[in-house]
């Protein structure tokens, strides 16, 4: 069945990188874009960014321009989110998301991924 | 950026009472060339990931409940629950794909 | 209402590269998207790209990739396409055409289908 | 790249016939994505049909479209004088692509 699964939870120290999984089963990847959106605790849901999973194209929010790198292993089914230069607010749970192509909307998200940075 | 306002922030509804939550973007997300309004709204349970509910701002995605209908274009969107069930307490969010995206703020449905 | 208005006719030799413009008025041209589609004598159309001016960047049929270039300059409302290393199989009628694959993934710039169309411009290569 | 075939080729009618077009995708195409296009000698294609059934501003009723999936048509209900031509579908997916084209002669 279609799904997407993300890796574990994270701890991190401030300044350090964290690099979260989404693994795409159950269809063709490259239709597909794949989104990354945050929730911090108590917070309203913020997209980040997105994949396209056909060509790696990537379009990046400005918030998060220059901190954030989407990429896809096409070969594993994977998407992948790099966040760096991490700080307290950006303790959150992380998710991706699928858009076909011309939807523009999620019909697939996965589990979430709660990245925790404390020192 | 596209900045998108809900109301109420949250609501206190009786069973099987009618819920309606209101969105307003800070411009239009119709597309006149294709015709449609590029808003979707999302029910979010606690621990769980957000569920489509409406896209294209009235269409339903398949197996939601048809108590839940979306209505409005241009700026002014409005998600309906008609008759609110237990199963139905979450936060719901409205999101645009006009320009890049933005959610809402959130309004949390809980019973009265 | 947007018109496009294109380039004369061209002769070119082989080898040699060819640049039509597509001047657009009417409607905002920084937000649409603009394709690029030939026709050869006696032939179906054929995409060979696309661009949104807003963005920039363009996208280009797997066929062309590496010999198409499309640009566009927001400040005279104008798109080009530069087809490079010429050959006799590319005389054709080149078209430009309101309209482009989405590839920006946002609903605004859903744009796909192709009205209205340049007159087009002929481009013949012949030694 | 989705492959669209029309047939006929030729379609000869005379005058008040109906024309049917058709247009057949190698994989599924969004209703959304689909148009058709007429086009006379000498000039630019002229879009007649979005979203698989909604026709262009100006373009008369007697054009239709139809069809979802892979099978999709185009039905003139009438020719009129000014309707021999040749007519494309085309998917704007991805990556476009045009049938080879349905001529549409006076018999």
């Known amino acids: 069945q279609v799904q997407l699964v993300q890796s574990g939870a994270e701890v991190k120290k401030p300044g350090a990188s964290v690099k979260v999984s989404c693994k795409a089963s159950g269809f063709n990847i490259k239709d597909y874009y794949m989104h990354w959106v945050r929730q911090a605790p108590g917070q309203r849901l913020e997209w980040m960014g997105w994949i396209d999973l056909e060509n790696a194209n990537t379009i990046y929010d400005a918030k998060f321009q220059g901190r954030v790198t989407i990429t896809r292993d096409t070969s594993a089914s994977t998407a992948y989110m790099e966040l760096s230069s991490l700080r307290s607010e950006d303790t959150a749970v992380y998710y991706c998301g699928r858009d076909a192509y011309g939807r523009y909307f999620y019909d697939v998200w996965g589990q979430g991924t709660l990245v925790t940075v404390s020192s | 950026d596209i900045v998108m306002t809900q109301s109420p922030d949250s609501l206190a509804v009786s069973l099987g009472e009618r819920a309606t939550i209101n969105c307003k973007s800070s411009q239009s997300l119709l597309n006149a060339r294709t015709g449609k309004n590029y808003l979707a709204w999302y029910q979010q349970k606690p621990g769980q990931p957000p569920k489509l509910l409406i896209y294209w701002a009235s269409t339903r995605e398949s197996g939601v409940p048809d108590r839940f209908s979306g209505s409005g274009s241009g700026t002014d969107f409005t998600l309906t629950i008609s008759s609110l069930q237990a199963e139905d307490v979450a936060v719901y969010y409205c999101k645009q794909s006009y320009s890049l995206r933005t959610f809402g703020g959130g309004t949390k449905v809980e019973i009265k | 209402q947007v018109q496009l208005v294109q380039s004369g006719a061209e002769v070119k030799k082989p080898g040699s590269s060819v640049k039509v413009s597509c001047k657009a008025s009417?409607?905002?041209?920084?937000?649409?998207?603009i394709s690029w589609v030939r026709q050869a004598p006696g032939q179906g159309l054929e995409w060979m790209g696309g661009?949104?001016?807003?963005?920039?960047?363009?996208n280009y049929a797997q066929k062309f990739q590496g010999r198409v270039t499309i640009t566009a300059d927001e400040s005279t409302s104008t798109a080009y396409m530069e087809l490079s290393s010429l050959r006799s199989e590319d005389t054709a009628v080149y078209y430009c055409?309101?309209?482009?694959?989405?590839?920006?993934?946002?609903?605004?710039?859903?744009?796909?289908?192709?009205?209205?169309w340049g007159q087009g411009t002929l481009v013949t290569v012949s030694s | 790249e989705i492959v669209l075939t029309q047939s006929p080729g030729t379609l000869s009618l005379s005058p008040g016939e109906r024309a049917t077009l058709s247009c057949r995708a190698s994989?599924?195409?969004?209703?959304?994505?689909l148009a058709w296009y007429q086009q006379k000698p000498g000039q630019a294609p002229r879009l007649l049909i979005y979203?698989?059934?909604s026709r262009a501003t100006g373009i008369p009723d007697r054009f239709s479209g139809s069809g979802s999936g892979t099978d999709f048509t185009l039905t003139i209900s009438r020719l009129e004088p000014e309707d021999f031509a040749v007519y494309y579908c085309?998917?704007?997916?991805?990556?476009?692509?045009f049938g080879g084209g349905t001529k549409v002669e006076i018999k």
């Open positions: 979203g698989a059934s």
């Open positions: 994989q599924s195409v969004s209703s959304s994505y």
């Open positions: 055409a309101r309209g482009a694959p989405n590839y920006y993934g946002s609903g605004g710039y859903d744009d796909g289908w192709f009205d209205p």
């Open positions: 085309q998917q704007f997916g991805r990556f476009p692509t």
């Open positions: 661009i949104i001016p807003i963005f920039g960047t363009a």
């Open positions: 009417g409607g905002t041209f920084s937000s649409y998207a």
